[in-house]
């Protein structure tokens, strides 16, 4: 427990004095926070926070569910923990299975244990499919499993936590990675056309077509040397997993002469930005 | 770099026990992946356990569990295997590896980036 000189504050003081309890299901958790400015305990697992203002936390039937960190806190904000596994041997597993990814980035897949002294926690493909060889992860038993740099390659990837108990494989519910693309080049874009000659009065419309992995890329189409909003429509499909296109359709229903000039269509996203032009040229009408 | 030490290997009778250590030195802060293999000659690498530094998660395959135990001593940087109960089968240059973080595949040697030079144990009957 934490010792701190005398005058300065010092963080509550937990019985009993130490940072992971294991109970079995069923049995009592009696928590007791000793501090002169107590203010509350907090319970945290997952998304779940609740919180107890009596300075002894008591769950008289202790259930899986009740795994999770209990943090007592006093009046000068300082806090103490004791992380509690309510060992079920129904219920290995405490999970969330919302489980997005970004490309390169780490992903942690919701499982903590309730029970800390199971053995071969790790990830399973669903229905004995292999995992990618190139995945690694990192184990937590409070908090899951930390897939290391995700891969594009690994969207939709179906999965199990698992873990060893009396020699046999347990798995847990089933979780569908979802990997948002990193941006790893720039937008192509491409114009319908490259140059219009018109009438005074005639239709001016333009399609610039926007490719990339995913939707969040940034488009407009901008008239060089002005600030004026111009009127878009857009079109857009995914066609499969990382093939975003946009379809962004200019148009200016009756062309006037001060119209003509040069229409820029841009798109930029994290990587970097690209355009493409094109070259109004309206006449008037003799 | 990271540089791997085992030590305690030897010759023991059948039914003996023995302790192995791996100490690590070097960038060992971020590597969280440590195992044990074997290698008998003539043979395959062979995954004997593994341990998780942050979190203490243990791997072992079936053969194994019950006789062998991993552990580790985290103010030492080393990991331990506890061998009992030791059969002539078990002979074997037993290696420590390490890496960032465990592959899908945790049995498979060929995914471990970092290595001792081993130590032999000899079960003699």
């Known amino acids: 427990q934490p010792s701190v000189s005398p005058g300065e504050p010092s963080p509550p003081s937990i019985h009993p004095g130490k940072s992971d309890l294991i109970v079995r299901v069923g049995d009592e958790i009696r928590l007791l926070c000793t501090d002169p400015g107590f203010v509350k305990w907090t319970f945290e697992i997952l998304d779940e926070t609740n919180e107890n203002k009596q300075n002894e936390w008591i769950t008289e039937k202790a259930e899986a569910t009740n795994t999770g960190k209990y943090t007592c806190t006093n009046k000068h904000g300082l806090s103490n923990s004791i992380y509690v596994f309510v060992r079920d041997p129904a219920k290995l597993f405490l999970v969330d299975r919302s489980l997005y990814g970004k490309e390169d980035n780490d992903t942690l897949v919701r499982c903590p244990l309730t029970d800390p002294e199971v053995t071969n926690y790790s990830l399973k493909g669903c229905q004995g499919k292999p995992l990618p060889k190139d995945l690694r992860f990192i184990p937590d038993p409070k908090a899951g499993i930390m897939i290391k740099s995700v891969k594009r390659a690994y969207h939709r990837l179906c999965l199990h936590c698992s873990v060893d108990q009396e020699g046999k494989s347990v798995l847990s519910e089933k979780f569908i990675l979802k990997v948002r693309p990193a941006f790893k080049a720039v937008p192509v874009v491409s114009v319908s056309k490259a140059s219009y000659l018109l009438r005074e009065g005639e239709e001016f419309t333009v399609t610039c077509t926007i490719k990339d992995v995913s939707s969040s890329v940034y488009s407009t189409w901008k008239r060089e040397n002005s600030q004026t909003k111009l009127q878009e429509k857009y079109n857009s499909w995914h066609h499969g997993d990382f093939n975003y296109e946009r379809q962004a359709t200019l148009t200016i229903s009756s062309a006037r002469v001060n119209d003509s000039g040069v229409f820029m269509c841009y798109a930029n996203n994290t990587f970097g930005s690209a355009n493409v032009t094109t070259t109004l040229e309206v006449v008037d009408k003799g | 770099e990271v540089q791997l030490v085992e030590s305690g290997g030897g010759l023991v009778r059948a039914g003996g026990s023995l302790r192995l250590s791996c100490a690590a030195s070097?960038?060992?802060?971020?590597?969280?992946?440590r195992a044990w293999f074997r290698q008998a000659p003539g043979k395959e690498r062979e995954f004997v356990a593994a341990i998780s530094w942050s979190g203490g998660s243990t791997y072992y395959p079936n053969s194994m569990k019950g006789r062998f135990t991993i552990s580790r001593d985290n103010a030492k940087n080393t990991v331990y295997l506890q061998m009992n109960s030791l059969k002539p089968e078990d002979t074997a240059v037993y290696y420590c590896?390490?890496?960032?973080?465990?592959?899908?595949?945790?049995?498979?040697?060929?995914?471990?980036?970092?290595w001792g030079q081993g130590t032999l144990v000899t079960v003699s009957s």
């Open positions: 590896a390490a890496d960032e973080s465990f592959p899908a595949y945790y049995s498979d040697y060929a995914l471990y980036r970092y």
């Open positions: 070097g960038r060992t802060f971020t590597y969280d992946a």
